[in-house]
């Protein structure tokens, strides 16, 4: 996506001081989906625009983050800013869109991240890199550091393919390059196998 | 897609104040940004400052503080940078852009 | 401010050379972004949020990085290609650019 934290970082340095404060109190009562935990009242609210945008991205990623944003401001009646994270959205999703065209039968023969979830759970041993890597982008912070809390390397290798249901191609795919950067002969004897 | 009109040419004198201008259009200009950019010739890019059209909310880089002022008109969708006590140093093209778009650019020349 | 130096200032490449050019940051920052431009032409928006390339951008080209090290790369060098590129933050006012590494053909 990529976009997105542009997008968001417009949107909130567009509000007067006074907007940037009700979008704030909004945000902390706001429904939010399962699995996303709500940033904490204390630092959220000394934030200014640049702290709140890579907030937003960190705790949501860039995807529910944008879509976070844009229903608040709906919700604030500034259909302006929310329409232009509208458009940003729809630009992602088309360039996603085609960026994953090839990859297509990929997916029909299954992913490597899915084909090899045991032996990877079994064999690597450099998590924390990986979940360096996948972090802000992939993971969120309460993901992140939820499967940094577990013990073992197999744990977190467990705890981090319980978020892996929800993941599209390009998670996978950046999880696969982790991998591939951090275990480069574990994911080559894989690939053979 | 966002498209960004810059003033033509400007001469000036030293010591004089001068207004460039920078036309959007295709998008709603108070829902992004319009950042100023300097160049002088054969010389890098040197960000000036950021102005955020509907809140008004300006950032600075701290060598053009005092030297430049932004400022933006939502009635005509126009963004403006005023440039004051004019030296030889200020000679260069001045660019606007939004998060992806450049416009063309406007050359001063301070000269007597 | 977040100071960006960028290496080398000026290379050249054969053409179907890989290119590597890269901007350090004085502190850590999110993503970075670059920019090309032409002599005589404004700047053009290149790459996003460090790796993901701007519309009409050939795939040969990319960019990673993380923390204060970043780089743009180019798989294949190629005759258009030459051209100067700068890197930019957004992470801190005020955004700072790199002082632009000129590539040349050979």
């Known amino acids: 996506m990529g976009r997105a934290r542009d997008a968001i970082l417009d949107a909130l340095e567009n509000l007067s001081g006074d907007e940037l404060k009700k979008f704030k109190m909004k945000l902390l009562t706001v429904q939010l989906r399962e699995g996303y935990g709500r940033i904490p009242r204390g630092a959220l609210l000394q934030m200014d625009a640049i702290d709140l945008t890579d907030k937003l991205v960190s705790y949501y990623l860039e995807s529910y983050g944008l879509e976070l944003t844009m229903t608040v401001l709906r919700d604030m009646g500034l259909q302006e800013l929310a329409e232009q994270l509208q458009t940003t959205k729809e630009e992602s999703g088309a360039v996603a869109a085609a960026a994953s065209v090839p990859a297509q039968s990929t997916a029909r023969t299954g992913h490597f991240v899915d084909q090899h979830r045991q032996a990877l759970i079994a064999r690597v041993t450099e998590v924390d890199g990986v979940l360096d890597a996948l972090h802000g982008s992939v993971l969120t912070e309460g993901q992140y550091q939820a499967v940094r809390a577990e013990t073992t390397s197999q744990d977190k290798m467990r705890k981090l393919f319980s978020f892996v249901p929800s993941w599209n191609l390009t998670c996978k795919d950046s999880l696969l390059q982790a991998l591939k950067e951090i275990h480069p002969y574990l994911v080559m004897d894989l690939e053979q196998s | 897609q966002v498209q960004l009109q810059q003033s033509g040419v400007e001469l000036a004198r030293p010591g004089a104040s001068v207004k460039l201008s920078c036309k959007a259009s295709g998008s709603t200009f108070t829902s992004y940004s319009i950042t100023w950019v300097k160049q002088r010739t054969g010389q890098g890019l040197e960000w000036i400052g950021v102005i955020y059209p509907r809140s008004d909310n300006t950032y600075y880089d701290e060598k053009f503080k005092g030297k430049a002022t932004l400022t933006a008109d939502k009635s005509s969708s126009t963004a403006y940078i005023e440039l004051r006590s004019l030296t030889s140093e200020d000679s260069a093209v001045y660019f606007c852009?939004?998060?992806?778009?450049w416009g063309q650019g406007t050359t001063l020349t301070v000269s007597s | 401010q977040i100071v960006l130096t960028q290496s080398p200032a000026i290379m050249s490449a054969s053409p179907g050379e890989k290119v590597t050019i890269t901007c350090s940051a004085s502190s850590s920052v999110s993503y970075m972004y670059w920019f090309q431009q032409k002599p005589g032409t404004s700047p053009k928006f290149w790459i996003y949020s460090t790796s993901n390339l701007a519309s009409g951008v050939p795939a040969r080209f990319s960019g990673s990085g993380s923390g204060t090290s970043y780089s743009l790369t180019i798989s294949r060098m190629e005759a258009e290609d030459a051209a100067t590129y700068y890197c930019q933050q957004r992470s801190n006012y005020p955004f700072t650019f790199g002082s632009g590494t000129k590539l040349e053909i050979k």
């Open positions: 852009a939004t998060r992806d778009y």
